[in-house]
Every structure is written in structure tokens, then in C-alpha cells.
Amino acid sequence: ESALITQQDLAPQQRAAPQQKRSSPSEGLCPPGHHISEDGRDCISCKYGQDYSTHWNDLLFCLRCTRCDSGEVELSPCTTTRNTVCQCEEGTFREEDSPEMCRKCRTGCPRGMVKVGDCTPWSDIECVHKESGTKHSGEVPAVEETVTSSPGTPASPCSLSG
């Protein structure tokens, strides 16, 4: 996978595949779904299902489409103007501090706590103290402390625009 960079044969990106449409940049920028050519004179379309761009840009390359991991479902496919939208499978969720993986939702709250929020693709079940109503930290309790309950009804898929 190597190519000599030459004057005569600029970048292979400029030898566009048949599906790669070209247009001229507007004020130096290319529209969503395109990237700019090496000389800045052309806009070249991203490759459907492979890469994308979401905004007017002067990017040399379109961005690689995300591929959903195992344990995720694809809510919408990658297009030339929008990245893939992936969501954790039912019974799992994605935390802000570990966004690269879906974690299993807890099946119940610790003793003395009551469930007030269901497992969703973006949050674990939510537990509060019966008396005070304060939230539980989210640490998984020791097995013997766990009061099991059936997982909540799965949330309807969130609509993410991108």
C-alpha cells in the first residue's frame, strides 16, 4: 500500500472511482459528503458505506465510518454525510467514562434501595435509598446484598442525528 507522490500523478484520491462525483469548492470548502482535492480545486465525494463528512469542510480525506462492535446494534448505517449510529444491545449500556464498550446493566438494587430507573442503552438501572431517596453510586453490590428484579422494559431507540 504505497505510492510515490509525483507531480504528474498527484494523489490517487484524484483518480476518482466512477461513483466519486466531483464539484467545485464554494469559498474553499466542500459540502457534506465530500472532501477537498489535493490542489484545492475539486470536491470529491466520500465513498458510501466506507467514509463520510458531516459539514462543509476543507478536509483532505473523508472520515472512516464507525463499525458497530459485537454487543451493539446498528440503528442507522453510515452514509456519505452521516456516521453509523450504534446502540448497546438490550440489557447493556454505555457509560460516559468508558464509551468504547457496552457494560451489562445490573439486574437489581442493593438491599435497602429501590429501583427508580430502568436499564437503557445509555444508562444502568437507577437505585435510590428507600428512606432518603438519595441515588446509589452505581457500584455493583456484592452478590449476597443484591435484591434482584426483572430488567426494565427496553427503551425505545434514541434518535441520534449526526
Epitope: A11, P12, Q13, N57, L59, R64
Partner: nanobody
Framework: EVQLVQSGGGLVQAGGSLRLSCAAS????????LGWFRQAPGKEREFIAA????????YGVDSVKGRFTISRDNAQNMGYLQMNNLKPEDTAVYRC?????????????????WGQGTQVTVSS
């Protein structure tokens, strides 16, 4: 996060060749475009070459066209800059960078991850 470790610099005579390597670890290297920059003493950093995530698209500035080859091997998490017919004016510290893409002027798009840099000295 991506970590980049460079190797392959050194001292070479004018007209000679060097191959710079950029070894990636951490998050999926194949999601990122790879760029090469250089900075000569007392000069601004210069964007010289880039390659997209799958190696299909490449970019090079006029000063290195016909002499430098950019490539990558996603299976090995490696990026390369093959430099032939080196000139004294190529003397600089060379750094690789990984980013989602690069803008026409060389500015990384999104978070950029940088190699530590390697000295290339071309003697006349």
C-alpha cells in the same frame, strides 16, 4: 488514545535515502489518517504528507513530490515515510501524527496523536 513511536532517522549524505517508521498502539490505528510533519531549525512546522485511513488517498507537498513515499500497513499498525534523493534542505525533526483527517493546510481534524519526533540530517 493512540500512541505513536517513531524510528528510522539519522545522518545521511545528500542523494541518499532514509525510511521513517511510525508504530501505533492503543486504539484502532486504521480509523485514523496519518500525517508527516517536519520542523527545520528556526523554521515553522511544515506539513509534508498524509495518507487516509485505508491507504487509498495520499497527499504530498510540492517540495517532496517525486522523492518521498507515504504508506501504511494497518495489519501491522505501522506508517512509513520513504525519503529518497534527500537534500540538505530536508534536514529537520520529522514527526508523524494520527488524526481523523487533515485539513488542506495540514491542521489535524479532531484530536491528534503525535510521535516523539526523529532527527534527519542531510549533509552535503
Amino acid at each position: 488514545e493512540v500512541q505513536l513511536v517513531q524510528s528510522g532517522g539519522g545522518l545521511v549524505q545528500a542523494g541518499g535515502s532514509l525510511r521513517l517508521s511510525c508504530a501505533a498502539s492503543g486504539r484502532a490505528f486504521s480509523n485514523y489518517a496519518l500525517g508527516w510533519f517536519r520542523q527545520a531549525p528556526g523554521k515553522e512546522r511544515e506539513f509534508i504528507a498524509a495518507i487516509n485511513w485505508n491507504g487509498e488517498n495520499r497527499y504530498g507537498v510540492d517540495s517532496v513530490k517525486g522523492r518521498f513515499t507515504i504508506s501504511r500497513d494497518n495489519a501491522q499498525n505501522m506508517g512509513y515515510l520513504q525519503m529518497n534523493n534527500l537534500k540538505p534542505e530536508d534536514t529537520a525533526v520529522y514527526r508523524c501524527a494520527a488524526a481523523l483527517s487533515f485539513r488542506l493546510g495540514g491542521e489535524p481534524y479532531g484530536d491528534a496523536y503525535w510521535g516523539q519526533g526523529t532527527q534527519v540530517t542531510v549533509s552535503s
